[in-house]
């Protein structure tokens, strides 16, 4: 698994809906896989993790100003939708087959 | 200033070119803000940090399962250009007006 | 080597419109920005826009909004200036010179009488 | 706008002279600051560019100075062919704007 040491990657999560308390609304699927971001974003910041010009030089200025400056940080980038069947405002079953930004599709250095 | 203990926020990160030794070739300007998102992203998570909903299930499994899970992070999820005179492959001086994704526009919880 | 020549003098009447040429050679035309520049008689420099020779988008002066219309052919590696409406206030000599302006064409005057 | 004044609007000067010239910009500019020379019926000719750097081809007695809102041209011993018109330029703003220019001429 993806520890501190390790370069930013996407790892599993699954995520129980009881555990967060959103089986009060959430009835299927019980849990999903959300995917986690975890790693470090160290120099150099590779072509995977897509990096942005700021993320390049904030990571150049950590390298320079450790204590002053934070790396990049290890972060979804792309999410994909999961299909949920939900209770809605009225109580009424509904299936959604997109329910947007659930699950991590790619990580990235932000 | 924004330290770990409080919320995610845009602070001021100047960035001077030599330090970072891209001097080489960016002849103008010499240093910039750059900003950096910084602070952590607690429960609850503030509209001001956009949250995207794999970040609001991600902080909730931290709040249950601190050691296994991260929070989410604070990073820009708003870029903003800067005007540049870089040196091309040629070696000719050369105003870019948008130098995209230089500085923070807007920080948010990822 | 890198050249910029511009389009031969013009005499225009007043609300008439021109349109000034300026051919690139001696480097890829789309590589860089390309400017335009006036100068009255006797008088100092005044930037009037620029153009983005890739997409062809373009920024200009405000004093110029809506008189002033600069585009390019790719093709021959020209831009072009035109200034519409014109005045006597408009005789002066127009500059093209590239994005860092350290290329200039050798200029083009323009006389607007009647 | 952002305007550039120069000082002085014209100088005279003989050869060997050490000569500078002022620009000031009405915000702060870093260092988008170029210089121009300029001879009757010609085009302008860049000197300098990002507030210092000598443009390929120009004499080093030219050299250029400051950041921010105040800027120098200083030519370290003038020559003959120096007289001429010097135009400093802001490219700062996307609203690119040039000094009113100051003569040099002969004392």
């Known amino acids: 698994s993806a520890g501190a040491g390790s370069h930013c990657q996407k790892t599993s999560l699954r995520v129980n809906f009881e555990d967060i308390g959103w089986d009060s609304w959430i009835i299927a699927p019980k849990e999903y896989e959300a995917y986690e971001c975890k790693g470090g974003c160290f120099f150099p910041l590779a072509d995977d993790v897509t990096p942005t010009k700021h993320a390049i030089v904030q990571t150049l200025v950590h390298l320079k100003f450790p204590t002053k400056v934070g790396k990049a940080c290890c972060v979804p980038t792309k999410l994909s939708p999961i299909s949920v069947l939900y209770k809605d405002d009225m109580g009424v079953p509904t299936l959604k087959y997109h329910y947007e930004g659930m699950s991590v599709a790619e990580c990235g250095c932000r | 200033s924004a330290g770990a203990g409080s919320h995610c926020q845009k602070t001021s990160l100047r960035v001077n070119f030599e330090d970072i030794g891209w001097d080489s070739w960016i002849i103008a300007p010499k240093e910039y803000e750059a900003y950096e998102c910084k602070g952590g992203c607690f429960f609850p998570l503030a509209d001001d940090v956009t949250p995207t909903k794999h970040a609001i299930v991600q902080t909730l499994v931290h709040l249950k399962f601190p050691t296994k899970v991260g929070k989410a992070c604070c990073v820009p999820t708003k870029l903003s250009p800067i005007s540049v005179l870089y040196k091309d492959d040629m070696g000719v001086p050369t105003l870019k007006y948008h130098y995209e994704g230089m500085s923070v526009a807007e920080c948010g919880c990822r | 080597q890198v050249q910029l020549v511009q389009s031969g003098a013009e005499v225009k009447k007043p609300g008439a419109s021109v349109k000034v040429s300026c051919k690139a050679s001696?480097?890829?035309?789309?590589?860089?920005?390309m400017n335009w520049v006036r100068q009255a008689p006797g008088q100092g420099l005044e930037w009037m826009g620029w153009?983005?020779?890739?997409?062809?988008?373009?920024n200009y002066a405000q004093k110029f909004q809506g008189r002033v219309t600069m585009t390019r052919d790719t093709s021959i590696s020209t831009a072009y200036m035109e200034l519409s409406r014109l005045r006597s206030e408009d005789t002066a000599v127009y500059y093209c010179?590239?994005?860092?302006?350290?290329?200039w064409g050798q200029g083009t005057l323009v006389t607007v009488s009647s | 706008d952002i305007q550039m004044t120069q000082s002085p609007s014209s100088l005279s000067a003989s050869v060997g002279d050490r000569v500078t010239i002022t620009c000031r910009a009405s915000?702060?500019?870093?260092?988008?600051l170029a210089w121009y020379q300029q001879k009757p019926g010609k085009a302008p000719k860049l000197l300098i560019y990002?507030?210092?750097n000598l443009q390929s081809g120009v004499p080093s007695r030219f050299s250029g100075s400051g950041s921010g809102t105040d800027f120098t041209l200083t030519i370290s011993s003038l020559q003959p062919e120096d007289f001429a018109v010097y135009y400093c330029?802001?490219?700062?703003?996307?609203?690119?704007?040039f000094g009113q220019g100051t003569k040099v001429e002969i004392k």
């Open positions: 330029q802001q490219l700062y703003a996307e609203s690119i704007t």
């Open positions: 915000q702060t500019i870093s260092n988008f």
């Open positions: 990002a507030a210092s």
């Open positions: 010179a590239r994005n860092y302006f350290d290329v």
């Open positions: 001696g480097y890829t035309f789309t590589s860089y920005y």
């Open positions: 153009i983005n020779p890739v997409q062809g988008n373009t």
